[in-house]
């Protein structure tokens, strides 16, 4: 099946202090390689979460990515702050034999818009 990375929401709004879920699904797990979430693009992009076991404060996976045939790579960001605003991308990589993993597909991005906490 052709690989497609889908981020169904163009944007989400969240009040500061709340949590938000950023959805991402894949149509195929092939080729073999990790899925990572970034905020921003190009040289200024920031790694937000990687489904490879590292610990990322405030960010967790929504479903069990270790389950066989799991195609859901959504994440939850907790205790959102204004600094979390930006566009988030779910990116699929192909594992290289020795060289670094190659970025092969990306979701269309989900903008996180942080609203002031209601007083």
């Amino acid at each position: 099946k052709e690989l497609k990375v889908t981020q169904p929401e163009k944007s989400v709004s969240v009040a500061a202090g709340d949590s938000t879920v950023l959805n991402c699904t894949l149509t195929s797990l092939l080729p073999v390689g990790p899925i990572k979430w970034y905020r921003g693009v190009g040289q200024s992009r920031l790694l937000i979460y990687s489904f490879t076991g590292e610990h990322f404060p405030r960010v967790t996976n929504v479903s069990d990515a270790t389950k066989r045939n799991n195609m859901d790579f959504s994440i939850r960001i907790s205790n959102v702050t204004p600094e979390d605003a930006g566009t988030y991308y779910c990116v699929k990589f192909q594992k290289g034999p020795s060289e670094p993993d190659t970025e092969i597909q990306s979701g269309g991005g989900t903008e996180v818009y942080v609203l002031a906490k209601p007083s």
């Epitope: 169904p8 163009k10 944007s11 709004s13 693009v41 566009t87 597909q105 269309g108 991005g109 903008e111």
Partner: antibody
């Protein structure tokens, strides 16, 4: 049929204000994000601002931030652009554009409203 | 922000000719790219989205291709109504949404 009709354009002096309106019909207005895009004489297209269907999420181009305000009245199927502190470089045809429901490209445009800022 | 560069700036062609317009992005936008046609006194019209998908009602003489940073719009046989200005737009890196500077296709 989708229709977008801009109004409110005209000639103003630098520093003055103007409000553009865009009357929408032929689709469920409140379900779609809407944008303003402008084109200065002899120049290309420049994105100005966007507002989500609910009105909760708003973005502006740096060139108009702090001077322009986008808003919408879903009960009237109308999009607005309040333009304050107008400058000569704001002279352009302003288009109202409806977004696709999944991605931020524009599937329908209005004919545009001409704004001329001149002393 | 992602800068889009369109080339050439102007094309002077005859009806029936085939032409290819190019749009280059300063960084990868994958296939998140659209093409529009603009004619004087008319609303801009969406031609292509997703780099290669034709919008509703667009004739099949228009085709788009490319991914990453290099994209093309091809008109297989120019009709009189195709003489216009064409713009590409990326919707991957945002905000802001950015457009190319446009390519004018004029009649010889």
């Amino acid at each position: 049929d989708v229709q977008l009709v801009e109004s409110g354009g005209g000639v103003v002096r630098p520093g003055e204000s103007l409000r553009l309106s865009c009357a929408a019909s032929g689709f469920t207005f409140s379900s779609y994000d809407m944008n303003w895009v402008r084109q200065a004489p002899g120049e290309g297209l420049e994105w100005v601002s966007l507002i989500s269907g609910s009105g909760e999420i708003i973005y502006y181009a740096d060139s108009v931030k702090g001077r322009f305000t986008i808003s919408r009245d879903n009960s009237k199927n109308t999009l607005y652009l309040q333009m304050n502190s107008l400058r000569a470089e704001d002279t352009a045809v302003y288009y109202c554009a409806k977004e696709d429901n999944r991605y931020r490209f524009f599937d329908y445009w209005g004919l545009g409203a001409l704004v001329t800022v001149s002393s | 922000e992602t800068v889009l560069t369109q080339s050439p700036g102007t094309l002077t062609l005859s009806p029936g000719e085939r032409t290819t317009l190019t749009c280059r992005a300063s960084q990868s936008v994958y296939t998140y790219l659209a093409w529009y046609q603009e004619k004087p006194g008319q609303a801009p019209r969406l031609l292509i989205y997703g780099a290669s998908s034709r919008a509703t009602g667009i004739p099949d003489r228009f085709s788009g291709s490319g991914s990453g940073t290099e994209f093309t719009l091809t008109i297989s046989s120019l009709q009189s109504e195709d003489f216009a200005v064409y713009y590409c737009q990326q919707y991957y890196d945002r905000p802001p949404l950015t457009f190319g500077g446009g390519t004018k296709v004029e009649i010889k």
